[in-house]
Amino acid sequence: QCKILRCNAEYVSSTLSLRGGGSSGALRGGGGGGRGGGVGSGGLCRALRSYALCTRRTARTCRGDLAFHSAVHGIEDLMIQHNCSRQGPTAPPPPRGPALPGAGSGLPAPDPCDYEGRFSRLHGRPPGFLHCASFGDPHVRSFHHHFHTCRVQGAWPLLDNDFLFVQATSSPMALGANATATRKLTIIFKNMQECIDQKVYQAEVDNLPVAFEDGSINGGDRPGGSSLSIQTANPGNHVEIQAAYIGTTIIIRQTAGQLSFSIKVAEDVAMAFSAEQDLQLCVGGCPPSQRLSRSERNRRGAITIDTARRLCKEGLPVEDAYFHSCVFDVLISGDPNFTVAAQAALEDARAFLPDLEKLHLFPSD
């Protein structure tokens, strides 16, 4: 869990490149002091700031760990020794997280809080994006185009990575029903040094605020604070959150007493997670034990399957997974308004999917 060894390794590798090879202990300073040339000035200060940022990101899981505390204390000592300020540029991170800042091109440095621009500058192409959605009972469309109907109750993570945490809380749609619906969504935009303060967004049925938990509508006072924003086109029923610093757009909707979640996210961001963060419905879909087959319907109310199909067909002419989800929801809830959730999910997918050939998924059962 504590990733201090990774921070140590990244620091060593960045100082090795400054030295042009050779070996170095994780916290050996090297080079002259002050603001002079060589390793002892700008380059080392950038590496130390990156090291400090890395320790900060892993701090909570490392609290009480001797190696962690030694590293942080050592960084402080080296920054004092080399007269480094804590604010300023950091060394380019290794190619694990979401895109690297542009380097050595002679062009102006890309905005560190504009993910797409930064990625395009570095790779000469736009980034790849992934789409995930949760709606209705809930039905989950994963990044990898799995489509499951889940019986999950309580709080389940849709996403849990280095940049984002999204948790959906579900409860039974009706007494005795197998199916559940999402009543609450919690989204955490994790602290990102240059760009945003940590921000929490929480929505519940009949309470879709157009603000973060602290009352703000952006990422805070940092230089890139505007790279996280929240808005609505339909107060009380729709909220859109743009997180440009991680190439992400999230839409939350309320229909028929349940919440829907839809996300378009940069691939590198979506995949920046460790082995311990393996339970994510957007990554793996519903765990097999939590999946409902369509044969597990327990119909309520007076709506027949033919009526449900007719209602759903109006807005969903293709008999794909969205159509079948719609029929399922209308039958189980007895509420024709559930057609809207599936229709909106399909529209979000149309807007968010990079490959429209994957828009219509067809269930196997």
Epitope: R60, R63, G64, H69, S70, E76, I80, R86
Partner: antibody, heavy 120, light 108 residues
Framework: EVQLVQSGAEVKKPGASVKVSCKAS????????IAWVRQAPGQGLEWMGW????????GFVQKFKGRVTATSNTDITTAYMELSSLTSEDTAVYYC????FGSGYDLDHWGQGTLVTVSS | SYELTQPPSVSVAPGQTARITCGGN??????VHWYQQKPGQAPVLVVY???DRPSGIPERFSGSNSGNTATLTISRVEAGDEADYYC???????????FGTGTKVTVL
């Protein structure tokens, strides 16, 4: 809205124990540590230590080790701090606070405080 | 162990600027946070990471930190700013949060 609500005032005899509760709401309880800080009458703030509700890990200042126990119940998003072998020097207001360790090294929301009076 | 020293008191007239210092060895290498505590109330975070303000805190509160001194500046002081102010850092080697001795700000 983030809120920390603490249990009410306590009067204890020397040698006894006190258990202070801190009910958290408005955020994901397991995503932040809880810190405990105390303030003797007319004195400054004294940091006691922290606990991670997710892992159960704790860290307390040496002077409290051996007589402090920090626990939590994640189902009811409540943290507890129990201090034993009380003396008159433990008379203070005890605060819990949300500890942004990592995303910041600060305490961004505080409980209202619990006055513990130790008197024979 | 790491120590933070603050002046016991600072007096300032309404509308003027109050500056509260927090001294510590190479404090400039650490993140400094400031809390306001009014009588009978819990502390409130007013500045974090040297100079950032939590939402809801007026722009009149600002901070700086370099060398051996961090400073909390309250401009255009109001009667409602009368309180005790504490600086705080994290002592990385000890894993302790350390509070300053506290400064009582009196608005004349």
């Amino acid at each position: 809205e983030v809120q920390l609500v603490q249990s009410g005032a306590e009067v204890k005899k020397p040698g006894a124990s006190v258990k202070v509760s801190c009910k958290a709401s408005g955020y994901i309880f397991t995503n932040y540590d809880i810190a405990w800080v105390r303030q003797a009458p007319g004195q400054g703030l004294e940091w006691m230590g922290w606990m991670n509700p997710d892992s159960g890990n704790t860290g307390f200042v040496q002077k409290f080790k051996g007589r402090v126990t920090a626990t939590s119940n994640t189902d009811i998003t409540t943290a507890y701090m129990e201090l034993s072998s009380l003396t008159s020097e433990d008379t203070a207001v005890y605060y819990c606070a949300r500890d942004r360790f990592g995303s910041g090294y600060d305490l961004d929301h505080w409980g209202q405080g619990t006055l513990v009076t130790v008197s024979s | 162990s790491y120590e933070l020293t603050q002046p016991p008191s600072v007096s300032v007239a309404p509308g003027q600027t109050a500056r509260i210092t927090c001294g510590g060895n190479n404090i400039g290498s650490k993140s400094v946070h400031w809390y306001q505590q009014k009588p009978g109330q819990a502390p409130v975070l007013v500045v974090y990471d040297d100079s950032d303000r939590p939402s809801g805190i007026p722009e009149r509160f600002s901070g700086s930190n370099s060398g051996n001194t961090a400073t909390l500046t309250i401009s255009r002081v109001e009667a409602g700013d009368e309180a005790d102010y504490y600086c705080q850092v994290w002592g990385s080697s000890s894993d302790h949060y350390v509070f300053g001795t506290g400064t009582k700000v009196t608005v004349l």
